[in-house]
């Protein structure tokens, strides 16, 4: 019968001829009366056999990631008779792995959106690298993830690639962050190969800023001939938030005379001071009113940012009109 051990050949061997092992018949007494032949894909080009001894050699550099095993056939013939000594047999040559592939992030580019002020531990995104080396061969494809850029705001779980928030962030200070993640094979041991990826993390707005008046004091004038409903001027607050979180409502906080009103222009986010009652210069020609401004939408959990509405004082001077 045939005698052989399992055949392995390391990939990427640079030698011109690498001895893999020996194929022989147990009838072979070593007197060179038998001839060994190799058949199948790779026979003669990738692998050769010593016809007399049955020794098998790899004569080409192999790449496991291209092809990890070869199935060949062996024959042994009695030279004298030309007859097969053993039935033709199939055997396998396995290409063994070396760590010749770095981890690669295949789903690039990575982008994630997370609300500003999210608590520590909030999951942002998971990045995954793949390594073409053999996962069953030692640590060649066992990866560890680490953060090269992004501290102190982000952290990455070493074995999963899950990125989490490690420090609260304020969109109004910085609205996006570039995080660089490294994946290293060999679980970080010497000889490890690595790959990196960038993750763009954008902060979405939450309503953590209340509107604040641009001026603590405004001065407006109104003619005593102005009819009720007249717009006598505008006031304006600013809000560092954006979109719906910056929508505001103006109102009167204090007007003993009940002469004025404030309406909100929701397109410009300005407050428009309106004459509610006609004024009479001879009766009163100086008014003072206090206005306040609040956000339109404030979720309950964000109310802590909206205690005490911003206020402004408006001095209104009545202009005299000569009466007939």
């Amino acid at each position: 019968g045939w005698v052989w051990n399992q055949f392995f050949v390391p990939e990427e061997m640079n030698t011109t001829s690498h001895h893999i092992g020996q194929l022989r018949s147990d009838l072979d007494n070593g007197n060179n009366s038998f001839q060994y032949k190799l058949l199948g894909a790779g026979a003669g080009s990738t692998f050769i056999i010593d016809e007399r001894t049955g020794d098998i050699y790899a004569i080409q550099k192999l790449d496991r990631e291209e092809r990890s095993l070869y199935i060949l056939r062996a024959q042994v013939i009695d030279i004298a008779t030309g007859r097969a000594v053993e039935p033709e047999s199939e055997f396998v040559i396995k290409v063994s792995d070396i760590n010749d592939n770095e981890p690669k992030f295949l789903d690039e580019p990575y982008e994630a959106i997370v609300p500003e002020m999210s608590p520590e531990g909030t999951l942002v995104i998971q990045v995954t690298a793949s390594d073409a080396d053999d996962p069953s061969s030692g640590n060649n494809a066992r990866l560890l993830y680490s953060l090269l850029q992004g501290q102190p705001y982000f952290s990455v779980e070493p074995t999963t690639g899950v990125i989490r928030i490690s420090s609260k962030m304020d969109r109004e200070l910085q609205d996006e962050y570039w995080v660089i993640i490294q994946a290293k094979d060999m679980i970080g041991q010497p000889g490890a190969l690595s790959g990196t990826t960038s993750v763009l993390i954008k902060l979405s707005d939450v309503n953590d800023n209340k509107p604040i008046f641009k001026e603590s004091l405004y001065r407006l004038t109104v003619s005593e001939s102005a009819p009720t409903g007249t717009s006598i001027g505008t006031i304006m607050a600013y809000d560092n938030d954006i979109g719906e979180n910056a929508e505001m409502d103006y109102s009167i906080e204090e007007d003993d005379s009940q002469t004025f009103d404030i309406i909100t222009n929701h397109e410009t986010q300005e407050g428009i001071v309106i004459l509610k009652k006609k004024v009479d210069f001879e009766h009163q020609n100086h008014y003072g009113i206090r206005a306040k401004v609040k956000n339109h939408h404030v979720p309950e959990q964000l109310m802590k940012y909206h205690t005490e509405a911003s206020t402004t004082f408006i001095k209104i001077q009545v202009e005299d009109v000569d009466e007939p």
Epitope: E215, S216, L217, Y218, R219, T221, E254, D256, S257, E282, H283, Q284, N285, H286, Y287, G288, R290, F313, K315
Partner: antibody, heavy 120, light 107 residues
Amino acid sequence: QVQLQESGPGLVKPSQTLSLTCTVSGGSISSSGYYWSWIRQHPGKGLEWIGYIYYTGSAYYNPSLKSRVTISVDTSKNQFSLKLSSVTAADTAVYYCARDGSSGWYFQYWGQGTLVTVSS
Amino acid sequence: EIVLTQSPGTLSLSPGERATLSCRASRNISSSYLAWYQQKPGQAPRLLIYGPSSRATGIPDRFSGSGSGTDFTLTISRLEPEDFTVYYCQQYGSSFTFGPGTKVDIK
């Protein structure tokens, strides 16, 4: 802290024009919403508001003095001025400049006052 | 114009006593448009109260203001030696007018 300082002649002849200047320091006369007033106090008597000006030049005067009073402003010098024409002995008084408040038309800041005597 | 009348003209009290000064307007004024000042000899008036019960910056809490309509009051809860001087009320709704003053002197 806003400070105001009056300056001008302490003696004016009858029928002439009294001229005083108020220099503002520690704040801009162009601050939005503030009015700059002149107020006087006859010797041993009460206070009388003369008029005010806004940094834009808009002025408003006490109706009883309106025909004789002009208040002007010079934002580049951070000053405002009072001119009172055709003075008589009844215009002898301590003249104060003042700025109104951030929550109303009351007088929050005052100069120390300057005595102007009308006499020949 | 709105005329302000202050009473009494002179108030004689001892240190530690409570002083109640009155200011009456010739017609209704909104309470938001009245102020009180203190004036010491040779000095400019100093704002005490505005609107009519808000204390100006740096004013001790023994000074308080109240009132509405035509009747307003300045109260000094416990007179200190430096409080013996002249007090004026002022309205700032219809132009600007001052009361004639109340002198608080030591009994």
